[in-house]
């Protein structure tokens, strides 16, 4: 805390300008009026204050707005935002996307800080849902943002927002998250034709059920192995050799390199060896010819 001392003669700030960077902390405290600071916040970010000086300016704003800053001030915080704690941010009511963008810009190129996470949380909760413009903005600044949300939080994403999602935004999503996002993507892209639809839906297929994969296999989509390897194992297991061959098209040859990895390994174990042999890839581990396969899960359901 800066000591309360009288402002030296001739040093009282009449406006927020560059001369203030040469003020000591105690001079800033004594010579800058909080109300003046609040009305001229737009100038602060253009002036290269030290972080110590920004501490003093923050203290002044805190005294002026103990219940939380108004958006007119928040919008112009600039580097002063880095001095805010999550507790400070929880007092704010940020409704403008422009304000959000301005504050995210300050942290650009860095990992998401607790301050930023709190700001985003406040903003999204205030809006009630993660709309397209917000998602567009957030994924532009933080490509991994979507995958940082819980499945519950993702359920508030409207299908229309899915258009803003880029493949790299889903890189770190786990199957539980893709389970939530896939049906939204399917709905969002439903009016697209076959090849265009596949390009858009491809990144979300880690959440696709068996019946959708079967449907895709009828459309000559030529799924690459990287996408296939991200599919849900339980969705891949019921696919026949013929369906997988159609699904992968020319990429089917890549199965050999992946035969020891899931879901390929588990899928092979479920196929008849003579069906696998038709691929001509030398895949081994299928059910030997003449063996009968009992689906015990089906038997339990009947009894």
């Amino acid at each position: 805390e800066v000591e309360k001392t009288a402002c030296p003669s001739g040093k009282k700030a009449r406006e927020i300008d560059e001369s203030l960077i040469f003020y000591k902390k105690w001079e800033l405290e004594a010579c800058v009026d909080a109300a003046l600071l609040a009305t001229q916040m737009d100038r602060v970010n253009a002036i290269p204050f030290t972080y110590e000086q920004l501490d003093v300016l923050k203290h002044k704003l805190d005294e002026l707005y103990p219940q939380g800053y108004p958006e007119s001030v928040i919008q112009h915080l600039g580097y002063l935002f880095l001095k805010m704690s999550p507790e400070d941010i929880r007092k704010w009511n940020v409704t403008s996307l422009e304000t959000l963008k301005a504050l995210l810009e300050v942290n650009k190129g860095h990992e998401m800080s607790p301050q930023v996470a709190t700001l985003i949380d406040r903003f999204v909760k205030g809006r009630g849902q993660l709309d397209k413009d917000t998602l567009d903005t957030l994924t532009a600044f933080y490509p991994g943002y979507l995958c940082s949300l819980s499945p519950e939080e993702l359920s508030s994403v409207p299908p229309s927002s899915i258009w803003a999602v880029r493949p790299q935004d889903l890189d770190t999503c786990d199957p539980r998250q893709l389970d939530v996002l896939y049906p939204k993507a399917r709905l969002a892209f439903q009016n697209m034709n076959g090849s265009e639809y596949f390009v858009k839906i491809q990144s979300f297929l880690g959440g696709a059920p068996t019946e959708d994969l079967k449907a895709l296999s009828q459309q000559n989509v030529s799924m690459d192995l990287a996408t296939f390897m991200k599919l849900r194992t339980d969705a891949v297991l019921p696919l026949t050799v013929a369906e997988v061959q159609k699904l992968l098209g020319p990429h089917v040859e890549g199965l050999k390199a992946e035969e020891r990895h899931r879901p390929v390994r588990d899928w092979i174990l479920r196929q008849r060896q003579d069906d696998l042999d038709t691929l001509g890839l030398g895949l081994q581990g299928g059910i030997p010819n003449g063996y009968l396969v009992l689906d015990l899960s089906m038997q339990e359901a009947l009894s």
Partner: nanobody, 116 residues
């Protein structure tokens, strides 16, 4: 992390010139603002000059005599000091702000002595 190392200090006669350098290494792409401070014996550290983007700022006591500049390609900050006075005698420190987290970095200082 950013490391700063000053050089170029020394003993000079009043009216003479010196050029201080501050070499930055580490995560230099994160540097937003750079500054020169000085501290004379028994006094507080004072801000001398600041460079932010293409804008420069000077303390009244050095205006017209000192020039701050930055070579981004070499990650080096300079302070050209002309018409030096005995009252410019001090340890000069280089300082840099990290752009995305609220912290700054300091060099170890370089001594400048101006004799009359």
């Amino acid at each position: 992390q950013v490391q700063l190392v000053e050089s170029g200090g020394g003993l000079v006669q009043a009216g003479g010139s010196l050029r201080l350098s501050c070499a930055a290494s580490g995560s230099t792409f994160r540097i937003r603002v750079m500054r020169w401070y000085r501290q004379a014996p028994g006094t507080e550290r004072d801000l001398v000059a600041v460079i932010s983007g293409s804008s420069t700022y000077y303390a009244d006591s050095v205006k017209g005599r000192f020039t701050i500049s930055r070579d981004n390609a070499k990650n080096t900050l300079y302070l050209q000091m002309n018409n030096l006075k005995p009252e410019d005698t001090a340890v000069y420190y280089c300082n840099a702000d990290d752009s995305g987290i609220a912290r700054d970095y300091w060099g170890q200082g370089t001594q400048v002595t101006v004799s009359s």
